[in-house]
């Protein structure tokens, strides 16, 4: 089949990095500067991606492969193949259309990207807050309030259990 196809279509013999030039009797011509063909038998070469401004070059374009971009420091990649660059924020912030804004009380973000998330509610797991949360860090949950009661042992009766859903202030 390949042999038949090549007899019918001389362009199928053109390797990656070339194109089948109709203006030159379907001869295989090298891709012009700033263009590439990643597969054989192509009738045109594709324009190389330009990495400029918010983008910077991670891999240069060659005659057989497109350029690859990442983001200039201060921004991070989004989308397949780094199709977009999005601004970094500091830990304890989230990105809004107004720029980077501090996390509201009761929320945190421990990364340079993403949104502020609510602190863990320790009491839902029957635990108490061991370390308070900040804008940058989640709370650390500790043992349940009953476990922390002084004198709780096999000798003395256990402290009365707290109402569910309540944690010490």
């Amino acid at each position: 089949f390949e042999r038949t196809r090549s007899l019918q279509d001389p362009c199928s013999n053109c390797p990656a990095g070339t194109f089948c030039d109709n203006n030159r009797n379907q001869i295989c011509s090298p891709c012009p500067p700033n263009s590439f063909s990643s597969a054989g038998g192509q009738r045109t070469c594709d324009i190389c991606r330009q990495c400029k401004g918010v983008f910077r070059t991670r891999k240069e374009c060659s005659s057989t492969s497109n350029a690859e971009c990442d983001c200039t420091p201060g921004f991070h990649c989004l989308g397949a193949g780094c199709s977009m660059c999005e601004q970094d924020c500091k830990q304890g912030q989230e990105l809004t259309k107004k720029g980077c804004k501090d996390c509201c009380f009761g929320t945190f973000n421990d990364q340079k990207r993403g949104i502020c998330r609510p602190w863990t509610n320790c009491s839902l797991d029957g635990k108490s807050v061991l370390v308070n949360g900040t804008k940058e860090r989640d709370v650390v949950c500790g043992p349940s309030p009953a476990d922390l009661s002084p004198g709780a042992s096999s000798v003395t009766p256990p402290a009365p259990a707290r109402e569910p859903g309540h944690s010490p202030q």
Epitope: G53, S83, M84
Partner: nanobody
Framework: QVQLVESGGGLVQPGGSLRLSCAAT?????NYWMNWVRQAPGKGLEW???????????YYVDSVKGRFTISRDNAKSSLYLQMSSLRAEDTAVYFC????????????????SGQGTTVTVSS
């Protein structure tokens, strides 16, 4: 071909003014949020300002509030940044950049930017 070309940069004294322009070709400017970002010598990229499709929403980084004004003329496919009361710390390469599809809804990614124009504030 989608393209953004900035112009208007130059050398200006502290306290002076400058107006940057950005010409958009290959797409309909009025469909997109637009941004200015800058890169000071030896520093990372910093977002400066953005403006929504019809110009009714404009936001700025704190350091330029009250001094810079972003605007657009969709009929002329142009974006502008009017800079006044310029300071040495405003020295940077300024880039205009397009907000990608879905900007402001589920991301704040920029998908196209220009080569930049250099602003130097010095006496």
């Amino acid at each position: 071909q989608v393209q953004l070309v900035e112009s208007g940069g130059g050398l200006v004294q502290p306290g002076g003014s400058l107006r940057l322009s950005c010409a958009a070709t290959g797409f309909t400017l009025s469909n997109y949020w637009m941004n200015w970002v800058r890169q000071a010598p030896g520093k990372g990229l910093e977002w400066v300002a953005n403006i929504n499709q019809d110009g009714s929403e404009r936001y700025y980084v704190d350091s330029v509030k009250g001094r810079f004004t972003i605007s657009r003329d969709n009929a002329k496919s142009s974006l502008y940044l009017q800079m006044s009361s310029l300071r040495a710390e405003d020295t940077a390469v300024y880039f205009c950049a397009r907000g990608g599809e879905g900007y402001g809804v589920d991301h704040y990614g920029l998908d196209v930017s220009g080569q930049g124009t250099t602003v130097t504030v010095s006496s």
